[in-house]
């Protein structure tokens, strides 16, 4: 079964600065990648990042900048300051979207007491759903 | 909730070309596409085409490929649905549906406009 | 001629359970998820199951799909007089690189 993994990062030289990595560990050609916070896509959460991977990607604030690391990783860098900021204990989720297979969502926060700069490594995540 | 409301039915001449609207309401676009289906009347649902709003991909039946254009402004939350070439055989309800097939990878429909009948006649 | 096939009509009597087949090939239900529409007359259909087997929330559990092979099928038990409708079954297929639908069932509640 396909899984999704999710690694977030508080940047070290801005302490309000955060990086959402996810990787999609599977066979299927991905079609869409979706980025939210707060909960999953649909179910509450609110969308950060959509990557499309012929099409590009449209982002919305605080999403500073979302790009492709790989064919199946992304990562999205989240500008720190004002209302919308993210902060520590706030729930970032993944969905990988493989047309006509389904999707692949997992979530992830900052690790506990972690110190800025460092992270969990990039484990897979609980699934969430699989459509 | 999200309410996708139709434009009103029309009656068009063989040969001229038709365009139905379909307007996204309580929710944006997102990442979520906009199919079109159609059903003649006494008749099953068929499957036109579909777009993906967000970055403007479609995707049309084979059967239809050539003869319709769908579209969508992204700012108002709209899609458009245009049929050229018109005969009798398309007098049929037109519906809009939400699908999630570029979200969720599935070609699924979870919400329906209302419906727009469109008459060919001469 | 519709790719996918069900019966024109299926009835039953209240209280009973009726099951609407659906068979379609190798290059749709045989690798894709299905998904089933309920038509109530005069309106627009609504999902009543997608993914095979599952129910958008709302739905009562009176509605179960399965899916087996290149044949799927949905279940309405416990009938009533508000099911009757038109039920279409739909999935993705490869060859035609669309979406299909059966040709919909009519189901009526008898007395």
């Known amino acids: 079964t396909p899984e999704v993994w999710v690694q977030v990062r508080m940047e070290a030289t801005e302490l309000s600065s955060f990086t959402i990595r996810c990787g999609f560990l599977g066979s299927g050609s991905i079609s869409l990648v979706t980025v939210s916070w707060g909960g999953p896509n649909g179910a509450g959460g609110t969308t950060l990042a959509v990557l499309h991977p012929e099409r590009g990607i449209r982002q919305w604030a605080p999403a500073r900048q979302a790009r492709w690391e790989t064919q199946s990783s992304i990562s999205l860098i989240l500008e720190g300051s004002g209302a919308s900021s993210p902060c520590a204990n706030t729930t970032f989720c993944c969905k990988f979207a493989s047309f006509p297979e389904g999707s692949w969502e997992a979530c992830g926060s900052l690790p506990p007491s972690s110190d800025p700069g460092l992270s969990a490594p990039p484990t897979p995540a609980p699934i969430l759903r699989a459509d | 909730q999200v309410q996708l409301v139709q434009s009103g039915a029309e009656v068009k001449k063989p040969g001229s070309s038709v365009k139905v609207s379909c307007k996204a309401s309580?929710?944006?676009?997102?990442?979520?596409?906009i199919s079109w289906v159609r059903q003649a009347p006494g008749k099953g649902l068929e499957w036109m085409g579909q777009?993906?709003?967000?970055?403007?991909?479609?995707k049309y039946a084979q059967k239809f490929q050539g003869r319709v254009t769908i579209a969508a402004d992204e700012p108002t939350s709209t899609a458009y649905m245009e049929l050229g070439s018109l005969r009798s055989e398309d007098t049929a309800i037109y519906y809009c549906?939400?699908?999630?097939?570029?979200?969720?990878?599935?070609?699924?429909?979870?919400?329906w406009g209302q419906g727009t009948l469109v008459t060919v006649s001469s | 001629q519709s790719v996918l096939t069900q019966p024109p009509s299926v009835s039953g009597t209240p209280g009973q359970k009726v099951i609407i087949s659906c068979s379609g090939s190798?290059?749709?239900?045989?690798?894709?998820?299905v998904f089933w529409y309920q038509q109530l007359p005069g309106t627009a259909p609504k999902l009543l199951i997608y993914?095979?087997?599952e129910r958008p929330s709302g739905v009562p559990d009176r509605f179960s799909g399965s899916k087996s092979g290149t044949s799927a099928s949905l279940a309405v038990s416990g009938l009533r007089s508000e099911d009757e409708a038109d039920y279409y079954c739909?999935?993705?297929?490869?060859?035609?690189?669309?979406?299909?639908f059966g040709g919909g069932t009519k189901l009526t509640v008898l007395g």
């Open positions: 549906a939400r699908d999630r097939m570029a979200a969720d990878g599935m070609a699924v429909f979870d919400y």
């Open positions: 309580g929710g944006t676009f997102n990442n979520y596409g």
């Open positions: 777009i993906i709003p967000l970055f403007g991909t479609t």
């Open positions: 190798s290059s749709n239900i045989g690798r894709h998820f």
């Open positions: 993914k095979n087997d």
């Open positions: 739909s999935s993705w297929d490869a060859a035609l690189n669309g979406v299909v």
